[in-house]
């Protein structure tokens, strides 16, 4: 039902990589424009977006509020230009999101590889810990922070002179491997959240391999 | 439920090949990682080797690097181990394992094997 | 590639005894290594992960600890369904490798 020129928005679904959360809808707008609303389970609704011509609404700063809690969104569609018109009941037409639970759903960003360095026989990698738009204490907080022992980093590493790929992981954002001498390697990491059934892996880093500029090398 | 089912086992002749297939259910394969796990008659469990299909990248163990490859197809929810240039000691039983990609990297789900007997 | 020496290759055990199982890693593994259950024509299950984690549905007579490079496998109490064969596993570098497993029979 509804006004006879308002369509109900459709196709709710959320777009989150390390807590940057962007809920899109369908359709294009022909003649109409949408409010976004969003609650916790037990909260109170509060509005986003008011009568936006756009199909989408970035709710990061509500989500981040609490990011283990489970949100729902809702999007109210309205005839442009007469935004008080409402459905037949009385109501201006929505429609409900999927529920989205942050901690465990968010897709994890592609890693950095921040650093090498090697050292004899041994070679030490770091990667960049991701700034989230998460706080605590008006600090914005690292994905380690957010996640804690929750997150762990596997490292692939090969020598530049073959294809096999070895693996490593680490619960910190550091890695210490045993290297041959004199052959050069090459490195990608990718973020795990092993306790989740979905969205588990982050796309793989960039490669990064030693001679180039990143890495250092210390002969001792 | 989450599953695997290993299949394609049998007999082959000195120098054959053969296809296992290890097909999962219950979860998407490029989520895990998949490692194949072989056991001889009356034998200790030999790791094969693995692949992470999310990117393809593998990694095998000495006895049977360059005669096997993994591989896997995520439109099938499908790894494969292809074995050739066959050995009378490459007969036992072969199992894929799911691999959590924890900090210990255990093997939490195994399929229930497939024989395969090499033997003129 | 690091070795997992497990002792003894075989035991034998009455129901109700406590029984030990060890591995030794070569070189230090950390925490990541986990062991296996296996029964004539079956699959290995798992046990314990990261040394000594009960993974679930494990009855809780077994445990798993860990010395430095030495880990230890633990059934406190022997059941009729636990004569089996278990086997350690490291992880901690790539190739993963097993012990030789230990036959668990019966006495």
């Known amino acids: 039902s509804g006004t006879t020129n308002t369509v109900a928005a459709y196709n709710l679904t959320w777009k989150s990589t390390n807590f940057k959360t962007i809920l899109e809808w369908e359709p294009k707008p022909v003649n109409q424009v949408y409010t976004v609303q969003i609650s916790t389970k037990s909260g109170d609704w509060k509005s986003k977006c008011f009568y936006t011509t756009d199909t989408e609404c970035d709710l990061t700063d509500e989500i981040v509020k609490d990011v283990k809690q489970t949100y729902l969104a809702r999007v109210f569609s309205y005839p442009a230009g007469n935004v008080e018109s409402t459905g037949s009941a009385g109501e201006p037409l929505y429609e409900n999101s999927p529920e989205f639970t942050p901690y465990l759903e968010t897709n994890l960003g592609q890693p950095t590889i921040q650093s090498f360095e090697q050292v004899g026989t041994k070679v030490n990698v770091t990667v960049e810990d991701e700034r989230t738009l998460v706080r605590r204490n008006n600090t914005f907080l690292s994905l380690r922070d957010v996640f804690g022992k929750d997150l762990i980093y596997t490292l692939y590493y090969w020598k530049s002179s073959s294809s096999g790929k070895k693996t490593a992981k680490t619960n910190t954002n550091e890695f210490l491997i045993d290297v041959d001498k004199g052959e050069n390697y090459c490195f990608s990491v990718q973020a795990v959240i092993p306790s989740r059934t979905v969205n588990r892996k982050s796309t793989d880093s960039p490669v990064e391999c030693m001679g180039q500029e990143k890495g250092e090398f210390r002969e001792i | 439920e989450v599953q695997l089912v290993e299949s394609g086992g049998g007999l082959v002749q000195p120098g054959g090949s053969l296809r296992l297939s290890c097909a999962a259910s219950?979860?998407?394969?490029?989520?895990?990682?998949i490692h194949w796990v072989r056991q001889a008659p009356g034998k200790g469990l030999e790791w094969v080797g693995y692949i992470d299909p999310s990117n393809g990248y593998t990694y095998y163990a000495d006895s049977v690097k360059g005669r096997f490859t993994i591989s896997a197809d995520t439109s099938k929810n499908t790894a494969y181990l292809q074995m050739n240039s066959l050995r009378a000691e490459d007969t036992a039983v072969y199992y894929c394992a799911r691999d959590i990609q924890s900090v210990s990297g255990e093997f939490d789900y195994w399929g229930q094997g497939t024989l395969v007997t090499v033997s003129s | 590639d690091i070795q997992m020496t497990q002792s003894p290759s075989s035991l034998s055990a009455s129901v109700g005894d406590r029984v030990t199982i060890t591995c030794r890693a070569s070189?230090?593994?950390?925490?990541?290594v986990a062991w296996y259950q296996q029964k004539p024509g079956k699959a290995p299950k798992l046990l314990i992960y990261?040394?000594?984690f009960l993974y679930s549905g494990v009855p809780s007579r077994f445990s798993g600890s860990r010395s430095g490079t030495d880990f230890t496998l633990t059934i406190s109490s022997l059941q009729p369904e636990d004569f089996a064969t278990y086997y350690c596993?490291?992880?901690?570098?790539?190739?993963?490798?097993f012990g030789q497993g230990t036959k668990v029979e019966i006495k």
């Open positions: 219950g979860f998407t394969i490029p989520d895990y990682i």
């Open positions: 596993q490291q992880h901690y570098t790539t190739p993963p490798t």
């Open positions: 990261s040394a000594s």
């Open positions: 070189q230090d593994v950390n925490t990541a």
